[in-house]
């Protein structure tokens, strides 16, 4: 740092004064010197370092008419909005010839009410769940003692006796306000008031109660909600065949979820209009007057298989002597599961019914009993899944096949009543 030399008498006739004030204060430091000849530029030092970007003004007044006469030079340093970084020892510095002169020091101090570096923030917390709040204040003057208040009631018997920078709250059962007071020798400052909103806890134990092909009944255990009763719970279901995002823990499903609201209690809901034999992910959140809980994790569930909703289509049945050829197409109606195969039943007028499991083929050749003289032979076909048989087609009569003719196609549908099966010699 530049140092003054004592070889010549200092040109300074006025030195900087002292400023002590609170944050935000505006003040001016002033020094004055009298020199002979060309007036020098006045520099300002803070704690021995030249202030390169000082907000200073310099005024020069000649005391005579000749340039070589004496000049009065006044430099003023303006400090706007006093901050901690402005504090320190201030001096003026001039270079005169080969010599450096430094004024006597003036001091800038900061002293006022405590200043908050950190204040408690608004937040939501689940009922009866621990959380922390932060508050930090500084002087000068130090020390600064904190006193936390909850709903305007002090949480300690005196400032500096309770938690200081961090307040640990073991849990709340009602929405509350928190603030902190900062005390120092100059007075008290109160922080902003943070509102801590108590929401219901996340529901627990989301599980399936019963499953049907197009509906699921689910139940859950509600979390605590403090003094605020739950008003309703919301259940979301999303198809999970493209739900890799859910598996990877993404917060939102890849498509618009199906949303249902449940009045509570009971904490149970029947989700309808679902696809059979389809994987879903479901989650639930519950709401009180204060707002909703967080969602549960996505729970993978699956609707069970159902039976096919319609019979096979386009059944044709032709007879050629003791052989009959039957073929059909997959039902147009929803299968409600994985098609495992077809059952076929045929029966003559006075003969017992014969039942066959055809598997997944869509045609079959039947070897008829005897010489094929059985009259009024009819055939029915049903598709089946793991859940059971779908409706049977209406009986299709076996028609004699004439070469060159197209085989007849029957689209009649039989009521979905199960035939009275018998197990003949077949």
């Amino acid at each position: 740092a530049p140092r003054g030399t004592q070889a010549e008498e200092s040109p300074f006739v006025g030195n900087p004064g002292n400023i002590t004030g609170a944050r935000g204060l505006t003040g001016t430091l002033r020094c004055q010197l009298q020199v002979q000849g060309e007036p020098p530029e006045v520099h300002w030092l803070r704690d021995g370092q030249i202030l390169e970007l000082a907000d200073s003004t310099q005024t020069q007044v000649p005391l005579g008419e000749d340039e070589q006469d004496d000049w009065i030079v006044v430099s003023q340093l303006r400090i706007t909005s006093l901050q901690l970084s402005d504090t320190g020892q201030y001096q003026c510095l001039v270079f005169l010839g080969h010599q450096t002169f430094v004024s006597q020091p003036g001091y800038v101090g900061l002293e006022g009410l405590p200043y908050f570096l950190e204040e408690p923030e608004d937040r939501t917390v689940a009922a009866n769940t621990p959380f922390n709040l932060s508050c930090q204040a500084q002087g000068p003057p130090e020390p600064v003692d904190l006193l936390w208040l909850q709903d305007a009631v002090p949480l300690a018997t005196a400032p500096g006796h309770g938690p200081q920078r961090s307040l640990h709250v073991p849990g709340l059962n009602k929405t509350s306000s928190f603030s902190c007071e900062a005390h120092n020798a100059k007075g008290v400052t109160t922080s902003r008031t943070a509102t801590i909103t108590v929401l219901p806890q996340q529901p627990r134990n989301l599980h399936l109660v019963s499953r049907q092909p197009t509906e699921l009944e689910v139940a859950w255990t509600p979390g605590l909600s403090g003094i605020y009763p739950l008003t309703h719970c919301t259940l979301q279901a999303v198809l999970s065949d493209d739900g890799m995002g859910i598996q990877a823990g993404e917060p939102d499903p890849p498509e618009e979820p199906l949303t249902s609201q449940a009045s509570v209690p009971p904490h149970q809901l029947r989700l309808g209009s679902l696809h059979p034999h389809t994987p879903y992910h479901i989650r639930v959140a519950c709401t009180s007057s204060q707002g909703p809980s967080s969602w549960t994790h996505w729970l993978p569930v699956e609707t069970p298989e159902g039976v096919p909703l319609g019979p096979p289509e386009n059944i044709s049945a032709t007879r050629n002597g003791s052989q009959a050829f039957v073929h059909w197409q997959e039902p147009r109606a929803p299968l409600q599961g994985t098609l495992l195969g077809y059952r076929l039943a045929y029966q003559g007028q006075d003969t017992p019914e014969v039942l066959m499991d055809i598997g997944l083929r869509q045609e079959v050749t039947l070897e008829l009993q005897g010489d094929g003289s059985v009259s009024n032979l009819t055939v029915c076909v049903a598709a089946y899944t793991a859940a059971g048989d779908g409706p049977w087609s209406l009986p299709v009569p076996l028609e004699a096949w004439r070469p060159g003719e197209a085989q007849p196609v029957h689209q009649l549908v039989k009521e979905p009543s199960t035939p009275a099966f018998s197990w003949p010699w077949w």
């Epitope: 300690a156 018997t157 005390h183």
Partner: antibody
Framework: QVQLQESGPGLVKPSETLSLTCTVS????????WGWIRQPPGKGLEWIGY???????SYNPSLKSRVTISRDTSKNQFSLKLSSVTAADTAVYYC???????WGQGTLVTVSS | DIQMTQSPSSLSASVGDRVTITCRAS??????LRWFQQKPGKAPKLLIS???NLAAGVPSRFSGSGSGSDYTLTISSLQPEDFATYYC?????????FGQGTKVEIK
């Protein structure tokens, strides 16, 4: 720097009221809490009570019926009054900020006729 | 009222010794505990606040520990100027209560 100074009579007659004043310099009594503690000769410390920056008070229940702490913010002073004193109230009386960073030097009050 | 029981009531030790003073509260005081040193004819001096926090200007040979209802003041290496009486204070509840004191004397 912060200084606290107790003042008041060193001798009080039994059944009379003990009155002490604590003058604070370097710290505004409109901040923090300010208390009185006493120590009978050769014995331990006993908390008497405090006055808060806003003027509310808290007293030791064992003395509550006899004690009053008040303040004069214009003089930056707070005071202790203890009524109906007996020889058992003979003690060194200290004033202090309740964080206990700063104490008065203490004043001995003897209760004797 | 919360009772504060300090032990021992007195102890004799030599310079350089490690000294431990304990304070037991009649209930959980959640670290609302201060330790003081008092020399004859002087006001007490704050050593520790919040059970563990060293007050400004107090030598690091002093330390506080504990939680719940049991607290300890430790002087790691006793110095000549440490011979004094030590008090604990609970400020969890009103009335604030002091321990009865521990006098540390020269052996």
């Amino acid at each position: 720097q912060v200084q606290l100074q107790e003042s008041g009579p060193g001798l009080v007659k039994p059944s009379e009221t003990l009155s002490l004043t604590c003058t604070v310099s370097g710290y505004s009594i409109t901040s923090n809490y300010w208390g009185w503690i006493r120590q009978p000769p050769g014995k331990g410390l006993e908390w008497i009570g405090y006055i808060t920056y806003s003027g509310s008070t808290s007293y030791n229940p064992s003395l509550k019926s006899r004690v009053t702490i008040s303040r004069d913010t214009s003089k930056n002073q707070f005071s202790l009054k203890l009524s109906s004193v007996t020889a058992a109230d003979t003690a060194v009386y200290y004033c202090a900020i309740t964080t206990f960073y700063y104490w008065g030097q203490g004043t001995l009050v003897t209760v004797s006729s | 009222d919360i009772q504060m029981t300090q032990s021992p009531s007195s102890l004799s030790a030599s310079v350089g010794d490690r000294v431990t003073i304990t304070c037991r509260a009649s209930q959980d005081i959640g670290n609302y505990l201060r330790w003081f040193q008092q020399k004859p004819g002087k006001a007490p001096k704050l050593l520790i606040s919040g059970a563990t926090n060293l007050a400004a200007g107090v030598p690091s040979r002093f330390s506080g520990s504990g939680s719940g209802s049991d607290y300890t003041l430790t002087i790691s290496s006793l110095q000549p100027e440490d011979f004094a009486t030590y008090y604990c204070l609970q400020s969890k509840e009103s009335p604030w209560t002091f321990g009865q004191g521990t006098k540390v004397e020269i052996k």
